[in-house]
């Protein structure tokens, strides 16, 4: 009988005596086998000990010379921890960052909503100056055009799922020269006809620009 084999153990064939070196019917385990953790369940004024391979949620395994035991996580807003001062899972609504729990991620870090962790975000440089106002690669011949500014990605995010902020943006601008030097003026009727064409061209250019920005962001 394997219970009799260990002379040091005072086992009762009871499931709560699993892993015990010393056990009683009323109080369960009072000492555990070497690699197990002692946990004391308290119910009102009564208690019984258990020997566990891993500690319950809210506790961590504390190794001690006399006996390993489960000890309570005392890190603010922490649900489970690895040690006295390193959290592994925060309470709902808090983000995990370097073993601590925060209500928002520190600067330069982005929240991963599926794991509620703060990971290194996408780092971008400063905006460039606004570019020249142009349309159809021309800087004259139209009343309105678009000017663009850009910024570089300094550091790629730790995970591909973290989006980078916009790295290029455009805005409507008034051309410096509506008429190109040496160009012929069009009659009023022709001007009206071309107005519709021009509006459509701007719309299409803006659409293409949006598509370009979106694909550019995906490629990053």
């Amino acid at each position: 009988n394997r219970w009799r084999r260990n002379k040091r153990a005072s086992y009762v064939s009871n499931p709560i005596c699993k892993g015990c070196l010393s056990c009683s019917k009323d109080n369960g385990c009072s000492r555990c086998q070497q690699k197990l953790f002692f946990f004391l369940r308290r119910e009102g004024m009564r208690q019984y000990g258990e020997c566990l391979h891993s500690c319950p949620s809210g506790y961590y395994g504390h190794r001690a010379p006399d006996m390993n035991r489960c000890a309570r996580c005392r890190i603010e807003n922490c649900d489970s921890c690895f040690s006295k001062d390193f959290c592994t899972k925060c309470k709902v609504g808090f983000y995990l960052h370097r073993g601590r729990c925060f209500d928002e991620c520190p600067d330069g870090f982005a929240p991963l909503d599926e794991t509620m962790e703060c990971v290194e975000g996408c780092e971008v440089g400063h905006w460039s100056e606004w570019g020249t106002c142009s349309r159809n690669n021309r800087t004259c011949g139209f009343k309105w055009g678009l000017e663009t500014r850009t910024r570089q990605i300094v550091k790629k995010p730790a995970k591909d799922t973290i989006p980078c902020p916009t790295i290029a943006e455009s805005r409507r601008c008034k051309m410096a020269m509506r008429h190109c030097p040496g160009g012929k003026r069009t009659p009023k009727a022709k001007e009206k006809r071309n107005k519709k064409k021009r509006r459509k061209l701007i719309e299409r250019a803006q659409e293409q620009h949006s598509v370009f920005l979106a694909t550019d962001r995906v490629n990053q």
Epitope: F39, R42, R69, R74
Partner: antibody, heavy 125, light 107 residues
Framework: EVKLVESGGGLVKPGGSLKFSCAAS????????MSWVRQTPEKRLEWVAS???????YYPDSVKGRFTISRDNVRNILYLQMSSLRSEDTAMYFC???????????????????WGQGTSVTVSS | DIVMTQSHKFMSTSVGDRVSITCKAS??????VAWYQQKPGQSPKLLIY???TRHTGVPDRFTNSGSGTDYTLTISSVQAEDLALYYC?????????FGGGTKLEIK
Amino acid sequence: EVKLVESGGGLVKPGGSLKFSCAASGFSFSSYAMSWVRQTPEKRLEWVASISSGGSTYYPDSVKGRFTISRDNVRNILYLQMSSLRSEDTAMYFCARGGDPGVYNGDYEDAMDYWGQGTSVTVSS
Amino acid sequence: DIVMTQSHKFMSTSVGDRVSITCKASQDVSSAVAWYQQKPGQSPKLLIYWASTRHTGVPDRFTNSGSGTDYTLTISSVQAEDLALYYCQQHYSTPWTFGGGTKLEIK
């Protein structure tokens, strides 16, 4: 710095009542269990009462039904109401942080990690 | 109730000596033992909990050993300021109980 200051002790006649308090500062009072421990004139320490952070109360049989522990988490004050006092209740009463019989912590809060300076109670006719 | 017995009411020692204060529980208390020091005119102070863990700020000359029912508080090199009453307490099951105390006297 954890600070516990008791007040309200004094001389009471047998059968009489007394309520004293312990003002806590320097820690998150509402998060901790609190206890009362007394020291007899012979210097023996005896556990008197405990209250969990959630308000559950625990007493030894010697004071059950006569003593009531309570707490005010807004004002950070622990109380002990004593009635039907006996001569054997004569002691120095200390308030202490920790010692919750209802919760296992596996750390310092299972013991009583900080104590006040104590308040003296004498029950005599 | 669990009875905690400190067999020596008084212990006399000299500065620099190693001293051991013993405590015996009436049943196995699973290392759930705390030690307190009470200096003259002061309130008790926690030294050790869970049999071997020193409380914040406690000098490392204070150690505890033991398991089951027998526990020993050892001061490796006694200092003049260690003159005090020492109590053991079990925090295993209610009612919490204390030993009768051991008064450490410096020769």
